[in-house]
Interface confidence: low
């Protein structure tokens, strides 16, 4: 699986999850998030050669098409597969509010 | 929606579905598919600016991150959203077989 366990331990050029730390205030301008200050959102990148973690029949077909037609601009793209939530604390006036934001942390990638 | 109705009628630079005809024999080397000879598989391409058909909270965050940090390599990618099946005819010996292949035709795209 193209997950953090594999990708963070290997120098993988092809589609894999990459570490990306995002500081809410500095990187997003989100001053309203009280905690955490930031988090590892991670992201997916790298080429999708034929059959590499293909998501659908279409991505398999497109991967083969791209292999046989390397000048073509159509190819699968490395995108998130499994995501995890992140619990944040923010304030409405002086009242603390806790909310779980879904799909915030990329744990694995796929070729789609 | 970034679907064929919209994308095929507009000169859209950002993420959209693009027409792509694939000939089974010439483009894939699949000599076993008797009919159709080929089909419009289509594909997704184009930049994913902030908030453009964002698939998850993560893609929204990544889009904003990329807007505020344009030198960053991390950005959402334009990938298939809705796919349709394709019915094909092939032969096993002299016996014709009809099969529906799932997720073969891209109808719309999203930023993931």
């Amino acid at each position: 699986a193209l997950d953090t366990n594999y990708c963070f331990r290997n120098l993988e050029e092809n589609c894999c999850v990459r570490p990306l730390y995002i500081d809410f205030r500095q990187d997003l301008g989100w001053k309203w998030v009280h905690e955490p200050k930031g988090y590892y959102a991670n992201f997916c990148s790298g080429p999708c050669p034929y059959l590499r973690s293909a998501d659908t029949t279409h991505s398999t077909v497109l991967g083969l098409y791209n292999t046989l037609n390397p000048e073509a601009s159509a190819s699968p793209c490395c995108v998130p597969q499994d995501l995890e939530p992140l619990t944040i604390l923010y304030y409405v006036g002086r009242t603390p509010k806790v909310e779980q934001l879904s799909n915030m942390v990329v744990k694995s990638c796929k070729c789609s | 929606a970034l679907d064929t109705n919209y994308c095929f009628r507009n000169l859209e630079e950002n993420c959209c579905v693009r027409p792509l005809y694939i000939d089974f024999r010439q483009d894939l080397g699949w000599k076993w598919v008797h009919e159709p000879k080929g089909y419009y598989a289509n594909f997704c391409s184009g930049p994913c600016p902030y908030l453009r058909s964002a698939d998850t909270t993560h893609s929204t965050v990544l889009g904003l991150y990329n807007t505020l940090n344009p030198e960053a390599s991390a950005s959402p990618c334009c990938v298939p959203q809705d796919l349709e099946p394709l019915t094909i005819l092939y032969y096993v010996g002299r016996t014709p077989k009809v099969e529906q292949l799932s997720n073969m035709v891209v109808k719309s795209c999203k930023c993931s």
């Epitope: 730390y21 988090y39 939530p85 992140l86 619990t87 604390l89 | -």
Partner: antibody
Framework: QVLLQQSGPELVKPGASVKISCKAS????????IHWVKQRPGKGLEWIGR????????NYTGKFKGKATLTADKSSSTAYMQLSSLTSEDSAVYFC?????????????WGQGTSVTVSS | SFVMTQTPKFLLVSAGDRVTITCKAS??????VAWYQQKPGQSPKLLIY???NRYTGVPDRFTGNGYGTDFTFTISTVQAEDLAVYFC?????????FGGGTKLEIK
């Protein structure tokens, strides 16, 4: 690899203060909270507070406000906790721990603990 | 602040047994609960985060479940090296309170 190295045991007199340290290595010190936890002999874990080394932001649990002061030095990647007006109730092992950096979800690395004994 | 009530306080089991520890939060913490193992003379070690996510390198005999206020931690087949105290902790809102702990002893 990630390591949190705490200072050695302390024997201090009642009424005095003590400052214990937690030196971090193997990760971006500024980007993750450092928590402090108290454990009295044979007892459970008690959360004291935490500090975000990036900007010095702190939070304390009520009973440790005024008792514990958390600071951090980014240049040496070291977090400190000062305990003041010590009494026998402050005799305990104190742990520093890093908030899990990949999901900010829990404390994934802990120091070895610093034993503080308050005795005259 | 949140109170985490952990039960039981003690567990005496044999190797091979299945054990379950429960933790009840005084109010909803969504799924922001972690479980730690502390062996005698050692620092606590993270086993489970976000209620059910096994931390890297943790054997799959350790599992966590729950949402809202009720959480469970299970060791499917206890081994001799599991002798330790186990703590739950809510990681939902400061102050991040711990449960009182469960001491697991092997017969």
């Amino acid at each position: 690899q990630v390591l949190l190295q705490q200072s050695g045991p302390e024997l201090v007199k009642p009424g005095a203060s003590v400052k214990i340290s937690c030196k971090a290595s193997g990760y971006a010190f500024s980007s993750s909270w450092i928590h402090w936890v108290k454990q009295r002999p044979g007892k459970g874990l008690e959360w004291i507070g935490r500090i975000y080394p990036g900007d010095g932001d702190t939070n304390y649990t009520g009973k440790f406000k005024g008792k514990a002061t958390l600071t951090a030095d980014k240049s040496s990647s070291t977090a400190y906790m000062q305990l003041s007006s010590l009494t026998s109730e402050d005799s305990a092992v104190y742990f520093c721990a890093r908030r899990m950096i990949t999901t900010q979800a829990a404390m994934d690395y802990w120091g070895q603990g610093t034993s503080v004994t308050v005795s005259s | 602040s949140f109170v985490m009530t952990q039960t039981p306080k003690f567990l005496l089991v044999s190797a091979g047994d299945r054990v379950t520890i429960t933790c009840k939060a005084s109010q909803s913490v969504i799924n922001a609960v972690a479980w730690y193992q502390q062996k005698p003379g050692q620092s606590p070690k993270l086993l489970i985060y976000y209620a059910s996510n096994r931390y890297t390198g943790v054997p799959d005999r350790f599992t966590g479940n729950g949402y809202g206020t009720d959480f469970t931690f299970t060791i499917s087949t206890v081994q001799a090296e599991d002798l330790a105290v186990y703590f739950c902790q809510q990681d939902y809102s400061s102050p991040y309170t711990f449960g009182g702990g469960t001491k697991l002893e092997i017969k």
